[in-house]
C-alpha cells in the first residue's frame, strides 16, 4: 500500500502552501524506501536516494514555480509514481447567510471569505437550539445535528425543510480543502430571516365610470404554504407614468381600489408582502403592472360588485366617502386577520 495519505481531491495531486516547506510523497514505494526525484520534463536530479529523506521530496519555501509534476523512481530506476504539486491556502471561515421565503423552510448560502486556490467542498449541517434544563445545555437526539441538503450542480446553497417557526437553529458550514477545514456557525431564527416572495398575479384594471380609480388585485406567492395560521399583509405602491414618487397604501386584503389616480394617465403599481405579525422583513416588490383609469361613463350593465353604487356620471370628490370595497371570494388559503390573531392566541 502507498505510504502517501490521499488528501481529499483528485488522485495523484499533493498540496502545499506558498512560502512554506512542502513534502512530496512517492506513492508507489514502501515507506522509507530511498528514491530519486525529477521534475517532469527536466532531466536533472532534484533529490537523490542518498538524501536520507526516504520516499519524500522536501521543497523549502515553495513558490508558484514549484507547482507542476514530479517523478520519483526507485533505486533501480523503476517508476515510483508521478505527483503533481498544487499550492494554495487552508480554508478560511466561509461567509454564510440564511433566508426564508415561508415559515416552514429556510435556505442558507455561502461563499469563501478567501480564495484558497485548491479544490474545495462544503459540509453543511444544522441543529435545533434547545435548552433541556436551567443548568443543562446537553443536546437531545431531537436537536440534531442533521445534514442540510445541498442543491445539486454545485450551487452554494442548502435547504432546511420542515423547520419550526418559533425555534432557533444553529447552522454549521465547514469549508474543506486538502490543507484543512474551517467552520462558520450561524444562529438563525425563522422569525428574523423570514422574507416572503413578492405577491404574484398583480393585475390593474380600470373601474368603469370612475376616471380617477384603479383596481389592483394579486395573489399570495406560490411559495407561501397553504395553512391559515400565518397570513401575509401587503403594501401597495402606485404612481402615474413619469412621476418620480410612489404613493403607498397598506391594503387589508388581496386587492385595493386606488381613488386618487390621475385621470387619463397610465399608472405603475407594485406590491410587497410581509408576515402579518411583522416577523422578518418585507418582500421585494413584485414586477410592476400598469393600468389606466377609464375615461367613459359607467355602463348600463354594471358588474355585480358595483350594484350598491348609485350611478354617478362623474368621479366623486376625493373627500367623498369611497364606495364600498368589492366583496371578494375569500382566498382559499386566507382567514380574516382577526381570526388569525385569535388562532395565534389559542396556539400561544
Amino acid at each position: 500500500s502507498s505510504p502517501c495519505p490521499q488528501a481529499w481531491g483528485p488522485p495523484g495531486v499533493q498540496y502545499g502552501q506558498p512560502g512554506r516547506s512542502v513534502k512530496l510523497c512517492c506513492p508507489g514505494v514502501t515507506a522509507g524506501d530511498p528514491v530519486s526525484w525529477f521534475r517532469d520534463g527536466e532531466p536533472k536530479l532534484l533529490q537523490g536516494p542518498d538524501s536520507g529523506l526516504g520516499h519524500e521530496l522536501v521543497l523549502a519555501q515553495a513558490d508558484s514555480t514549484d507547482e507542476g509534476t514530479y517523478i520519483c523512481q526507485t533505486l533501480d530506476g523503476a517508476l515510483g509514481g508521478t505527483v503533481t504539486l498544487q499550492l494554495g491556502y487552508p480554508p478560511a471561515r466561509p461567509v454564510v447567510s440564511c433566508q426564508a421565503a415561508d415559515y416552514e423552510n429556510f435556505s442558507c448560502t455561502w461563499s469563501p471569505s478567501q480564495i484558497s486556490g485548491l479544490p474545495t467542498r462544503y459540509l453543511t449541517s444544522y441543529r435545533k437550539k434547545t435548552v433541556l434544563g436551567a443548568d443543562s445545555q446537553r443536546r437531545s437526539p431531537s436537536t440534531g445535528p442533521w445534514p442540510c441538503p445541498q442543491d445539486p450542480l454545485g450551487a452554494a446553497r442548502c435547504v432546511v425543510h420542515g423547520a419550526e417557526f418559533w425555534s432557533q437553529y444553529r447552522i454549521n458550514v465547514t469549508e474543506v480543502n486538502p490543507l484543512g477545514a474551517s467552520t462558520r456557525l450561524l444562529d438563525v431564527s425563522l422569525q428574523s430571516i423570514l422574507r416572503p416572495d413578492p405577491p404574484q398575479g398583480l393585475r390593474v384594471e380600470s373601474v368603469p365610470g370612475y376616471p380617477r380609480r384603479l383596481r389592483a388585485s394579486w395573489t399570495y406567492p406560490a411559495s407561501w404554504p397553504c395553512q391559515p395560521h400565518f397570513l401575509l399583509k401587503f403594501r401597495l405602491q402606485y404612481r402615474p407614468a413619469q412621476h418620480p414618487a410612489w404613493s403607498t397604501v397598506e391594503p387589508a386584503g388581496l386587492e385595493e381600489v386606488i381613488t386618487d389616480a390621475v385621470a387619463g394617465l397610465p399608472h405603475a403599481v407594485r406590491v410587497s408582502a410581509r408576515d402579518f405579525l411583522d416577523a422578518g422583513t418585507w418582500s421585494t416588490w413584485s414586477p410592476e403592472a400598469w393600468g389606466t383609469p377609464s375615461t367613459g361613463t359607467i355602463p348600463k350593465e354594471i358588474p355585480a360588485w358595483g350594484q350598491l353604487h348609485t350611478q354617478p356620471e362623474v368621479e366623486p370628490q376625493v373627500d367623498s366617502p369611497a364606495p364600498p370595497r368589492p366583496s371578494l371570494q375569500p382566498h382559499p388559503r386566507l382567514l380574516d386577520h382577526r381570526d388569525s390573531v385569535e388562532q395565534v392566541a389559542v396556539l400561544a
Epitope: 530519486s36 525529477f38 527536466e42 532531466p43 536533472k44 536530479l45 537523490g48 517523478i71 523512481q73 533501480d76 530506476g77 523503476a78 517508476l79 508521478t82
Partner: antibody, heavy 117, light 107 residues
C-alpha cells in the same frame, strides 16, 4: 534476467523510413523508461529520445523530433522506434536501452541500419 | 545543447597502472554526470552515476569525482578487461548528451 532483443539489420534507401523493435523480458515492462540511442560507425553515442513507462510520454532530441516516433505495445512488452526521411548519415547501430528517467542500465544488442542508394 | 569534452582522446597505459579520465561540461551541470564503458562490438555499460555513485556489479576499482563542470573517472589499477572506450553522459538538460569518448588502450 533482463533482456532486450532488437530486430535485425535493415538496409534502406534515402528518403525511406525504418522501424526498429525492441522486445523486453525479465522485468515489468511498464515500470521503466525505454531510451533509444544510436552510434554512427567509429563515432560516439547519440541519444534520440525516451518513452515513459506507463503513460507513453516521450522526450525527443530536438535534432530528431520531426523524424522520429517512439511507441510501445504493452501487451507484448515491445518498444518501437521509427525514423523517417532517412539519409546516408543515419547509417548507424541503433540501440534500445532500459533505464530510469535519464540513465541507460540495460541495452539491446543493437540494430544496424544502413542507408544507401 | 550541453557539450561534453573528454580528454585525452586516447590514453595508453599498462595493466596495474592507475587511469585518470577527464570530462568537462560546457556549463555547470552539478553532479548530473555519468560514465559508461564500451568494448568493441558490444553495447555500453553503466559504470558510475551522478559523478560518484557506484553501480551494483561494477568493480570497486572504478570511482568517479567532480561537480559543476569538471569530472574525473579513475580506475585505480587497470585490469586487462578494462581496456575499452569510456564515455561520459550528462543529464542536466535535454537532450541527454555524451562526450566523444576516451579510448583506453594497452601500452
Amino acid at each position: 534476467q533482463v533482456q532486450l532483443v532488437q530486430s535485425g539489420a535493415e538496409v534502406k534507401k534515402p528518403g525511406a523510413s525504418v522501424k526498429v523493435s525492441c522486445k523486453a523480458s525479465g522485468y515489468t515492462f511498464t515500470n521503466y523508461w525505454m531510451h533509444w540511442l544510436r552510434q554512427r560507425p567509429g563515432q560516439g553515442l547519440e541519444w534520440i529520445g525516451n518513452i515513459g513507462p506507463s503513460d507513453s510520454k516521450t522526450h525527443y532530441n530536438q535534432k530528431f523530433k520531426d523524424r522520429v516516433t517512439m511507441t510501445v505495445d504493452k501487451s507484448t512488452s515491445t518498444a518501437y522506434m521509427e525514423l523517417s526521411s532517412l539519409r546516408s548519415e543515419d547509417t548507424a547501430v541503433y540501440y534500445c536501452a532500459r533505464g530510469d528517467y535519464v540513465l541507460f542500465t540495460y541495452w539491446g544488442q543493437g540494430t544496424l541500419v544502413t542507408v544507401s542508394s | 545543447d550541453i557539450v561534453l569534452t573528454q580528454s585525452p582522446a586516447t590514453l595508453s597505459l599498462s595493466p596495474g597502472e592507475r587511469a585518470t579520465l577527464s570530462c568537462r561540461a560546457s556549463q555547470s551541470i552539478s553532479n548530473n554526470l555519468h560514465w559508461y564503458q564500451q568494448k568493441p562490438g558490444q553495447a555500453p555499460r553503466l559504470l558510475i552515476k551522478y559523478a560518484s555513485q557506484s553501480i551494483s556489479g561494477i568493480p570497486a576499482r572504478f570511482s568517479g569525482s567532480g561537480s559543476g563542470t569538471d569530472f574525473t573517472l579513475t580506475i585505480s589499477s587497470l585490469e586487462p578487461e578494462d581496456f575499452a572506450v569510456y564515455y561520459c553522459q550528462q543529464s542536466y538538460s535535454w537532450p541527454l548528451t555524451f562526450g566523444q569518448g576516451t579510448k583506453l588502450e594497452i601500452k
